[in-house]
C-alpha cells in the first residue's frame, strides 16, 4: 500500500472547499476537499438530503 503525503492546504486556497476541509495531497499535486456530512462535489458545493422511507401502514 503506497503512503500518501498530505498536509493542510495553503492560505492561497482559502475558501476552496465550500463545506469541508481542504487537504493538500503533496505527491499528487492536488488539493482535495474532505466534505462535511450531507455535502458532495469536488469542492463540497452540493448539498444532498438522505430521504428516509416513511414507515408503512402495515408496520404501524
Amino acid at each position: 500500500v503506497a503512503q500518501v503525503s498530505i498536509t493542510k492546504c495553503s492560505s492561497d486556497m482559502n475558501g476552496y472547499c465550500l463545506h469541508g476541509q481542504c487537504i493538500y495531497l503533496v505527491d499528487m499535486s492536488q488539493n482535495y476537499c474532505r466534505c462535511e456530512v450531507g455535502y458532495t462535489g469536488v469542492r463540497c458545493e452540493h448539498f444532498f438530503l438522505t430521504v428516509h422511507q416513511p414507515l408503512s401502514k402495515e408496520y404501524v
Epitope: T7, S10, S11, D12, M13, G15, Y16, L18, Y24, V26, S29, Q30, N31, V42, R43, E45
Partner: antibody
C-alpha cells in the same frame, strides 16, 4: 485530455483595453481557481491575480488593482482577463494557469503588444 | 504581498557541476514553494512543488529543500539540456515569483 486554450495575439494602442480569453476543456473550471501570469519580453514571470469561478471571488496583485478585471463564464467554461489603460510596459505574453485540482497547469500564452 | 528574492540572477557552470539557486521569502511561506524551468519561447515547466516534491518525469538530479523563509534548488550534475531560466514561486498567500536565474554553460 485537459487543455487551456487562449485567444490569439493582440496589438493595441496605448490607453486602450485588451480582453484575453482562456477556454478550458476536459475539466470544469468551477472545480479550480484560474490564475493569470504575464511575462514581458526578456523579463521574469509576474502573477497578476486569480478568480474562483464557482463563487466569482477575485484576488489581484496590488500593482494591478483597478486596472485588471478577471472574470469567468461557467456556462462556456471560459475565464477572461481584461487589462485597461494599456501602456508600452504591458507588452507581454499573458498566461492563464489552472490550480486546485491539479497543481499549475498552463495555457499556451497570448502575446499582447502595445504600440502607437 | 510576499516578496521573493532569488539569487543569483545568472550563473555560468560546467557540465557536471553542482548548481545551487536560493530564494528568500519576506515571511514564512510554510514550504509552499515551487520551482520552474523555462526555455526560450516556451511556457514554464513545473519541476518541484511543496519545497521538495519532484514532478513526474523530472530527472532526479533536480532537488529542493528549505523551510521558513529560506529555500534552495539544486541541480546535482548540470547537463547541457538544463540550460534555461529557473524561477521560484511562493503559493502560500496569493502568489509571487522570484526574479529568475539564468543558467548557462561555461
Amino acid at each position: 485530455q485537459d487543455q487551456l486554450v487562449q485567444s490569439g495575439a493582440e496589438v493595441k494602442k496605448p490607453g486602450a483595453s485588451v480582453k484575453v480569453s482562456c477556454k478550458a476543456s476536459g475539466f470544469n473550471i468551477k472545480d479550480t481557481y484560474i490564475q493569470w501570469v504575464r511575462q514581458a519580453p526578456g523579463q521574469g514571470l509576474e502573477w497578476m491575480g486569480r478568480i474562483d469561478p464557482l463563487r466569482g471571488n477575485t484576488k489581484y496583485r496590488e500593482k494591478f488593482e483597478g486596472r485588471v478585471t478577471i472574470t469567468a463564464d461557467t456556462s462556456t467554461n471560459t475565464a477572461y482577463m481584461e487589462l485597461s489603460s494599456l501602456r508600452s510596459e504591458d507588452t507581454a505574453v499573458y498566461y492563464c494557469v489552472r490550480s486546485g485540482t491539479l497543481f499549475d497547469f498552463w495555457g499556451q500564452g497570448t502575446l499582447v503588444t502595445v504600440s502607437s | 504581498d510576499i516578496q521573493m528574492t532569488q539569487s543569483p540572477s545568472s550563473l555560468s557552470a560546467s557540465v557536471g557541476d553542482r548548481v545551487t539557486i536560493t530564494c528568500k521569502a519576506s515571511q514564512d511561506i510554510h514550504k509552499y514553494i515551487a520551482w520552474y524551468q523555462q526555455k526560450p519561447g516556451q511556457a514554464p515547466r513545473l519541476l518541484i512543488q511543496y519545497t521538495s516534491t519532484l514532478q513526474p518525469g523530472v530527472p532526479s538530479r533536480f532537488s529542493g529543500s528549505g523551510s521558513g523563509t529560506d529555500y534552495t534548488f539544486t541541480i546535482s550534475s548540470l547537463q547541457p539540456e538544463d540550460i534555461a531560466t529557473y524561477y521560484c514561486l511562493q503559493y502560500d498567500n496569493r502568489r509571487t515569483f522570484g526574479g529568475g536565474t539564468k543558467v548557462e554553460i561555461k
